[in-house]
Interface confidence: low
């Protein structure tokens, strides 16, 4: 039984030799005795190698200690060189002696680790490496040989040294080129070599550590988690992986580390560590960190694993139910949802599925590249959880707003000048969404505004006055807005009535809604003559003769000239409104006219003997004021109607009536020139009498106080120079003829 004092009072074991270093010759016997106050143990060099049969440890009595052990090694060899340690068995208190076994035939000791014969070095200027060629003789002259190429290193008392207990020390970069090294000692002209050491240059740089999947991972309880951690390093790197993960309730994590074949041509090494959990539970939720260490360098990467107890799907906040957009803009309707796993997203418009195309892209958000009015409607997004198949739907109404568009802006105004004293009507037809409640009218005197042709807004007025303030201008009345369905769109029509055209002015209609504003500026140029008339009819038909007459007071005007607005004058029509043609006469076609005079007026006539469709257009009559030399212009739009053979649209209905009633029938004929209509009864031409009335150019036939003999087949025939068209109707007269007094 071991008896002893508490550790506090223990003295180190006592050795039989007083020296710290003991030198003995090879082949002699080494014997050291150790005494102490507790159970003792001996430890000697290469103890783990099979040396026990040569080493004898025996109990020894005598002296004042009952704890005593003697170590004996007969016939020592150079390899027995090293530290001999006697220590207490259960307390870390010991005494050591270093023994050199001087063996001139084998001055280098082969240690246990030397069996590998490998020296690992790093290419680092500041690092030193130890080649463990320890010696059995302390004062040897040792050099280090490196090859290939052959190079010898000798201790320099500084960074290169040899110590019998350690080996040969030198900066590692000095031998990084070498494939192998060995130590060499000279004793009595005899050369002795240590074992060969292979030099392995070890890298340490870790370029990066990549986790896959890279971002937050979402799983449902029971699913498999696989995390791959890939490290890229420089060559000759040894790597250790460590995973830090939430403390799991069950030990079901599996980690597999392996080297990965790098891509050809890359000067990098790749390592992969895979963490697998076959069936995750809620307790596996948390942060997972992969740490890669090369000894000198550590790199890490982390990800968050979220474990849901079950699949779910729900919309997040901020999903709009109404989206408003302006025509032409890009519309984006994002879907905000919370889901595991990611949902299938389907979009529908007014109940019909939407597929992506070049104008519309569907997915996590609906994108309409350039929204049109046709895109307005109800859009429904349906999210489906692919595991639970739970569905959530949300509807978004898309309202497409249209800034006010004023229809007349696109047209050429048929008038540029207005006759003094006449009543005139100006109109703005506006389409907008949301529809307009108000269209504002403004005005300004013509001389208070400047005119810049070719600009998008050719008129510039410093300020506009509201039409209610018509002081100094024309008396105005704005009629109540009317709403009309034009080209399938609900439009607002605002009319400005000028009671008497007395002053030249500019009028502006302005419409504003939430999508924007629109305006139209109308030039209202008032002249006291000239006047234009069209003879013989206001709207002649092609191949008819037609004359344009421009009449001006001979005392006021001179230099009457006709012009036609042609294709080379299109710049006149550009921009916000019609350019005042008087300011741009050089751009017009001058026409030859015939001048007539009467007692008060000059009349300039342009005659078309055989009018064609090419003759229609805008004609300008220009006259110069004799006093002021100011030109006055008037525009007339000449419309030539195309020739058209007669046509009777629709059928004439058969009519049944009783004696004494009235029959009315209309012949719905059209054509150009206006057809001449003739009625026949039973193929006999019908003539007017007291009971038969023909009206509206024979278009309407009325038979009053019908008699039995008025029944029969009536035919309406419409004829012009291009031909005739006919339609028939049957009149049936019921009832008996009353006897007259004459009978």
């Amino acid at each position: 039984a071991s008896v002893g004092l508490p550790g506090d009072f223990l003295h180190p074991p006592k050795l039989s030799t007083q020296k710290d270093i003991l030198t003995i010759l090879a082949n002699t016997t080494l014997q050291i005795t150790c005494r102490g106050q507790r159970d003792l143990d001996w430890l000697w060099p290469n103890a783990q190698r099979d040396s026990e049969e040569r080493v004898l440890v025996t109990e020894c009595g005598g002296g004042d200690s009952i704890f005593c052990k003697t170590l004996t090694i007969p016939r020592v060899v150079g390899n027995d060189t090293g530290a001999y340690k006697c220590s207490y068995r259960d307390v870390d208190i010991a005494s050591t002696v270093y023994v050199y076994v001087r063996d001139y035939r084998s001055p280098f000791i082969a240690s246990v680790s030397d069996q590998h014969g490998i020296v690992y070095i790093t290419e680092n200027k500041n690092k030193t490496v130890v080649i463990p060629c320890r010696g059995s003789i302390s004062n040897l002259n040792v050099s280090l040989c490196a090859r290939y190429p052959e190079k010898r290193f000798v201790p320099d008392g500084n960074r290169i040294s040899w110590d019998s207990e350690i080996g040969f020390t030198l900066p590692s970069y000095m031998i990084s080129y070498a494939g192998m090294v060995f130590c060499e000692a000279k004793i009595n002209d005899e050369t002795y070599q240590s074992i060969m050491y292979i030099v392995v240059v070890v890298g340490y740089r870790i370029y990066d550590v990549i986790l896959s999947p890279p971002h937050e991972i979402e799983l449902s309880a029971g699913e498999k988690l696989v995390l791959n951690c890939t490290a890229r390093t420089e060559l000759n790197v040894g790597l250790d992986f460590t995973w830090h993960s939430p403390p799991s309730k069950s030990h079901h994590k599996k980690i597999v580390n392996r080297d990965v074949k790098p891509f050809p041509g890359t000067v990098a090494k790749m390592f992969l560590s895979t963490l697998t959990i076959e069936s995750v539970t809620k307790s596996d939720q948390g942060e997972y960190t992969c740490v890669a260490s090369s000894g000198r360098m550590i790199k890490r990467n982390r990800t968050f694993v979220r474990v849901h107890t079950k699949p779910f799907i729900a919309f997040g906040s901020g999903m709009k139910s109404l989206v408003e957009a302006t025509v032409g803009s890009q519309v984006r309707i994002p879907v905000k949802y919370l889901s595991y796993p990611a949902p299938d997203i389907k979009w529908y418009r007014n109940g019909r599925p939407i597929e992506s195309n070049y104008t519309m892209i569907v997915g996590d958000e609906l994108t309409i590249m350039e929204v049109t009015e046709r895109d307005a409607g109800n859009y429904t997004v349906i999210l489906t959880n692919p595991i639970s198949m739970e569905k959530q739907s949300h509807m978004v109404s898309l309202v497409v707003n249209v800034p006010p568009q004023i229809g007349e802006k696109a047209l050429i105004s048929p008038m540029d000048s207005y006759q003094y004293g006449t009543m005139q009507t100006l109109t703005c037809t506006v389409y907008a969404n949301p529809p307009l409640h108000h269209i504002q009218w403004y005005w300004q005197l013509e001389e208070a505004c400047s005119y810049r042709p070719g600009q998008t807004s050719p008129y510039a007025c410093k300020e506009w006055r509201h039409v209610e303030d018509f002081q100094g201008g024309n008396k105005i009345e704005v009629t109540k807005n009317q709403y009309a369905l034009i080209e399938g769109k609900n439009k607002t029509v605002s009319t400005l009535v000028i009671q008497a055209a007395n002053v030249s002015a500019l009028y502006k209609c302005e419409a504003i809604n939430k999508a924007g504003r629109g305006e139209r500026v109308i030039s209202f140029h008032v002249i006291r003559g000239p006047e234009i008339t069209v003879q013989p009819a206001a709207q002649p038909t092609e191949q008819e003769s037609v004359s344009l007459l421009c009449t001006a007071d001979r005392n006021t005007f001179e230099n009457l000239t006709w012009y036609k607005l042609g294709s080379q004058a299109t710049s006149v029509h550009m921009g916000e409104s019609l350019t005042p043609v008087c300011k741009n006469l050089d751009a017009l076609w001058k026409l030859n006219g015939t001048m007539f005079s009467n007692s008060t007026n000059d009349i300039l006539i342009v005659a078309f003997q055989n009018a064609s469709l090419q003759d229609q257009g805008d004609y300008v009559c220009s006259a110069q004021d004799k006093k002021t030399k100011k030109r006055h212009c008037l525009v007339k739009q000449l419309i030539i109607l195309e020739r058209m053979a007669p046509m009777i649209t629709g059928n004439l209905e058969n009519q049944t009536t009783t004696i004494g009633e009235t029959i009315e029938v209309t012949c719905p004929a059209s054509g150009n020139p206006t057809p001449h209509i003739t009625w026949f009864k039973d193929n006999e031409t019908l003539v007017e009498d007291s009971g038969i009335v023909l009206r509206d150019g024979n278009r309407n036939l009325t038979i009053r106080r019908v008699r039995k003999e008025d029944g029969g087949l009536y035919t309406c025939q419409a004829c012009n120079v291009l031909g005739c068209a006919r339609a028939e109707t049957l009149f049936i007269i019921e009832g008996a003829q009353e006897k007259t007094n004459l009978e």
Partner: antibody, heavy 119, light 111 residues
Amino acid sequence: QSLEESGGRLVTPGTPLTLTCTVSGIDLSSYAMGWVRQAPGKGLEWIGFISSSGSTYYASWAKGRFTISKTSTTVDLKITSPTTEDTATYFCANNYDDYGDFLHYFNIWGPGTLVTVSS
Amino acid sequence: AVVLTQTASPVSGAVGGTVTIKCQASQHIYSNLAWYQQKPGQRPKLLIYAASKLASGVPSRFSGSRSGTEFTLTISDLECADAATYYCQSYYYSSDSTDNTFGGGTEVVVK
């Protein structure tokens, strides 16, 4: 799984007060915790919550007035500068169902702790 | 922020009968609504979540439904133990805001 609030007492206006919710059987690194209060005779009022990752979210009226923090087993609610309007029973609550990390209805509630703010 | 408007208190029902409580949301909250029961001096108890899903351990006499932004809690086969105050709660989250509000509560009286 259970929750228990503590720290409720009578305080004077302006004196900071911290309430603690002690958690049993719930891993706070996996679940979010919320705080709800109820003034005497009044309805429930949501204050805020702390997510599993430690992010905090507050009702707009509670921002700056309350601070939520947590350790591995407790969740604290600090009333930074109490006023008499803060007199209420304070509940801590948890969504142990975990219907998504941020969809918080509460299926586990503590019994509540009463805070009285009076001068 | 979302405002939840509940049926005015009290709502009365006879034992064995049915009562319905309505909760109107001021904006779309989808199905993100829960119902709670609270008796005097006690902590609230979850009845319904996700507008219509029954919480575990809650009798099937309790049911929830949604129509747009209007939510309804129906208690059928009314029992004396159902006398309590019932609260609706909206809950949802997005990266930039959270809205997690309770309705004002509706007291149910059982005759």
